[in-house]
């Protein structure tokens, strides 16, 4: 079939693709706030099939300002076109739509983790999903920051097969009555600019000589 | 099985009008956006025109983009093309289809639209 190909792309939206927990999530939001819908359509497009236009059937009449794509978008060599329209009731407000290649345009979330702090070490749990396809690991590398007094250390674990299920990583040779500070993030082989996670703290307990000498006192 | 059945074509001078219907059976036809192609003589299909389901997104190929108007009514299950200005080489077979990808269809008959003096 040989076509020209639609122009879909309209800014009046700003849209975000995301990688949440190993899932695509596109969000968006409106640039004139006045506009205010009562529910979302959100169909999408392929550069190689221009003159299609899916309807993601769980982001149709959509309230949220956001949509779960994993099983959609699977392409990280496709150029995707969302078109976004807004409803008020059964009145159409506006169509809105982006180009998106997955490979430079997603941005990575941290994934969840929880930290436990012993005498002189930490381990770090990073949750990942229990099952992760893999065109969603993108040749993503997990970072984990370790912070104290100042003084910011890079470790990057290797992972084993892919990033799935739960993942514990101790960071060791710690100093015992100690604030360490512990960040998680995915980085992308394309240095793209990374998402980091909030801080979480721990002030490591004393060691056996520390304890020895409050009991001297 | 998605079922369309184009009419309303005919023989019109170049400057006259004509309005194409596409009915449609077998399938939720308010769920899925709808598009027109075409079939000139000799000639590949050709990409017109797409709406998207509620209507509130349409796209037309350069050739006939302020000429044909696409158009639908979902409680009639029916998609439109009203074809103005038409020039001899609007000259074609027009079919209309589901424009998904991941729909399985069969093209239906068509419509012939020819333009002549």
């Known amino acids: 079939i040989s076509y020209d190909s639609p122009d879909y792309t309209d800014e009046s939206c700003t849209f975000k693709i995301s990688l949440r927990n190993f899932r695509s999530i596109l969000s968006w939001e409106l640039k004139n706030h006045s506009i205010v819908p009562t529910h979302y359509t959100l169909l999408y497009t392929i550069m190689s099939k221009p003159e299609d236009l899916k309807v993601v059937k769980n982001c149709a009449n959509t309230t949220r300002s956001f949509c779960d794509l994993t099983d959609e978008w699977r392409s990280t060599h496709e150029a995707y076109v969302t078109v976004l329209e807004g409803f008020s009731g059964n009145t159409t407000l506006f169509s809105c739509s982006h180009n998106f290649w997955l490979a430079i345009d997603m941005s990575f979330e941290p994934p969840e983790f929880e930290i436990v702090g012993f005498t002189n070490h930490i381990n770090v749990m990073v949750k990942f999903p229990s099952i992760v396809e893999e065109e969603l690991q993108f040749d993503l590398s997990l970072v984990i920051e370790e912070q104290s007094e100042g003084i910011v250390k890079k470790h990057k674990p290797e992972i084993k097969g892919n990033m799935s299920g739960n993942f514990t990583y101790i960071i060791d040779k710690l100093i015992p009555n100690t604030n360490y500070c512990v960040s998680v993030y995915l980085e992308h082989s394309d240095e793209q600019a990374v998402i980091k996670s909030p801080l979480k703290c721990t002030l490591l307990p004393p060691g056996q000589e520390s304890e020895s000498a409050e009991s001297a006192k | 099985q998605v079922q369309l059945q184009e009419s309303g074509g005919g023989l019109v001078q170049p400057g006259g009008s004509l309005r194409l219907s596409c009915a449609a059976s077998e399938f939720t036809f308010s769920e899925y956006s709808m598009k027109w192609v075409r079939q000139p003589p000799g000639k590949g299909l050709e990409w017109v025109s797409t709406?998207?389901?509620?209507?509130?997104?349409?796209r037309y190929a350069e050739s006939v983009k302020g000429r044909f108007t696409i158009s639908r009514d979902n409680a009639k299950n029916t998609l439109y093309l009203q074809l103005n200005s038409l020039k001899t080489e609007d000259t074609a077979m027009y079919y209309c289809?589901?424009?998904?990808?991941?729909?399985?269809?069969?093209r239906g008959q068509g419509t012939q639209v020819t333009v002549s003096s």
């Open positions: 289809s589901v424009a998904d990808w991941s729909v399985t269809q069969r």
């Open positions: 709406i998207s389901p509620s209507g509130g997104t349409t």
